[in-house]
Interface confidence: medium
């Protein structure tokens, strides 16, 4: 996929845009709002009726190099007795998100862009059927 | 890729960090073809913590659209169908990366950018605070 | 068509470890769960637990907690469970089945078998 | 726990019979499933949300019930149905099984 141009009806390209070869972009992985943080302190994974473990992802050929996945801790939901109902289902949520990989060519190094998917939580849901046909 | 050359030290030196600034192939590769949308695109109705999606749009950033999730009630959907306030809707929230033109309006330059977005919804037990 | 596929019998040493897999095909394999039913000579079928590939959730039965794990490789489509500590009384048939997507069906509703694979524990 | 019991635990009729199984939970549930083995296969589903029929299952069987009291009946015993049949819940955490009713051929 590629990414869109900017819409000619928006704007006209300025004059300050820096030469970029053909086929390719600039990129500055310096990030914006890098110190923005979510705060982890109120624990919903554990408290939530479909609770989710973290597991970090590593790659140093990745940027950012490190990628927090969650995963649904059991099939069913926790019912308010703290037991599983498997009546219900605990299910991912995911998300898109961009990374850049780094690739090694020899004595070359080249820069792709990636979509990645996060599995960010989990969430109870009623299963459209109950039961096998 | 946009393939750039390593140091004169090339195979031993190796770079651990990314530089600042890289040029990037315009084409995004797209590893996900794990998941299958249609299957989750109903979550938000069938969640026992339902929530709605709101339309977040910005031609400076790409990807230009993001959905962001607002949960429908303070409460969760119990079994008959009613909002239990015993239990608490709450929004799930995640540090995404997309790209901001930098220069503004340009075409072909871009600045990562990390935005908080509210993907989903989950049922939560409160913390009970009793008021002394 | 759907078929579930499971390795070999075996016959373990009392103490040891063993390590069960199930090569599902004819599905999308991260899409189901995947549960084990172990049956021992003359008894009832016991429900021990089920994964999800695409989630990592795993359910057990509390009879079968610190005994048997179940895991998953998504890239081979194969399910194992492993159990530890093995004693007579796990002398058994083990069966993988299919369990629902927690989509259009639930997680639990079970409709796909192995063959089953004999686990046999004598010194 | 629910625990499934079974009745009886082995029976022997003739074909053509009528054939009725029982199961009792423990507590009450609100779907049943029931499951065929036949010697040395691998269980089949038979019957699925108490009272309909699994795919490819002849109409000779049929399923009824709620609560805690549910049966399994074959209006007509033909010699294929030798087996042991399985009443399986999943109403309540873990999934819980019958002990079997053998049924054989007199």
């Known amino acids: 996929r590629k990414i869109p141009k900017v819409g000619h009806t928006f704007f006209q390209k300025p004059e300050s845009c820096p030469p970029v070869p053909g086929g390719s972009m600039k990129l500055d992985i310096g990030i914006i709002n890098e110190n923005q943080r979510v705060s982890m302190s109120r624990n919903i994974e554990s408290r939530s009726t479909s609770p989710w473990n973290y597991t970090v992802t590593w790659d140093p050929n990745r940027y950012p190099s490190e990628v927090v996945q969650a995963q649904c801790r059991n099939l069913g939901c926790i019912n308010a007795q703290g037991k599983e109902d498997i009546s219900m289902n605990s299910v991912p949520i995911q998300q898109e998100t961009l990374v850049v990989r780094r690739k090694h060519q020899g004595c070359s190094v080249s820069f792709q862009l990636e979509k990645v998917l996060v599995t960010v939580g989990c969430t109870c849901v009623t299963p459209v059927i109950h039961h096998v046909q | 890729g946009i393939t750039i050359p390593r140091n004169p030290g090339c195979p031993n030196s190796e770079d651990k960090n990314f530089p600042r600034t890289v040029m990037v192939n315009l084409n995004i590769h797209n590893r996900n073809t794990n998941t299958n949308p249609k299957r989750s695109s109903d979550y938000y109705n069938r969640s026992t913590s339902p929530w709605n999606l709101h339309r977040n749009e910005d031609p400076e950033r790409y990807p230009s659209v993001i959905w962001e999730a607002k949960c429908r009630h303070l409460g969760c959907i119990n079994a008959d169908g009613n909002v239990d306030y015993h239990m608490n809707s709450v929004p799930i929230q995640q540090e995404i990366l997309v790209l901001r033109r930098e220069p503004p309006h340009c075409p072909n330059s871009f600045r990562l950018e990390k935005i908080l977005v509210s993907v989903g919804c989950t049922c939560v037990t409160p913390i009970v605070h009793h008021v002394a | 068509q759907v078929q579930l596929v499971q390795s070999g019998a075996e016959v373990k040493k009392p103490g040891a470890s063993v390590k069960v897999s199930c090569k599902a095909s004819?599905?999308?394999?991260?899409?189901?769960?995947m549960h084990w039913v172990k049956q021992a000579p003359g008894q009832r079928l016991e429900w021990m637990g089920g994964i999800n590939p695409n989630s990592g959730g795993v359910s057990y039965n509390q009879n079968f907690k610190g005994k048997a794990t179940l895991t998953v490789d998504t890239s081979a489509s194969t399910a194992y469970m492993e159990l530890s500590s093995l004693r007579s009384e796990d002398t058994a048939v083990y069966y993988c089945?299919?369990?629902?997507?927690?989509?259009?069906?639930?997680?639990?509703?079970?409709?796909?078998w192995g063959q089953g694979t004999t686990v046999t524990v004598s010194s | 726990d629910i625990q499934m019991t079974q009745s009886p635990s082995s029976l022997s009729a003739s074909v053509g019979d009528r054939v009725t199984i029982t199961c009792s939970a423990s507590s009450s549930v609100n779907y049943m499933h029931w499951y065929q083995q036949k010697p040395g296969k691998v269980p089949k589903l038979l019957i699925y949300d108490t009272s309909k029929l699994a795919s490819g299952v002849p109409s000779r069987f049929s399923g009824s019930g709620s609560g805690t009291d549910f049966t399994l009946t074959i209006s007509s015993l033909q010699p294929e149905d030798v087996a042991t049949y399985y009443c399986?819940?999943?109403?309540?955490?873990?999934?819980?099984f019958g002990q079997g009713t053998k049924l054989e051929i007199k």
């Open positions: 089945a299919r369990g629902g997507d927690g989509y259009y069906t639930n997680y639990f509703d079970i409709d796909y």
């Open positions: 004819g599905y999308t394999f991260n899409e189901y769960t």
């Open positions: 399986q819940q999943w109403n309540s955490h873990p999934l819980t």
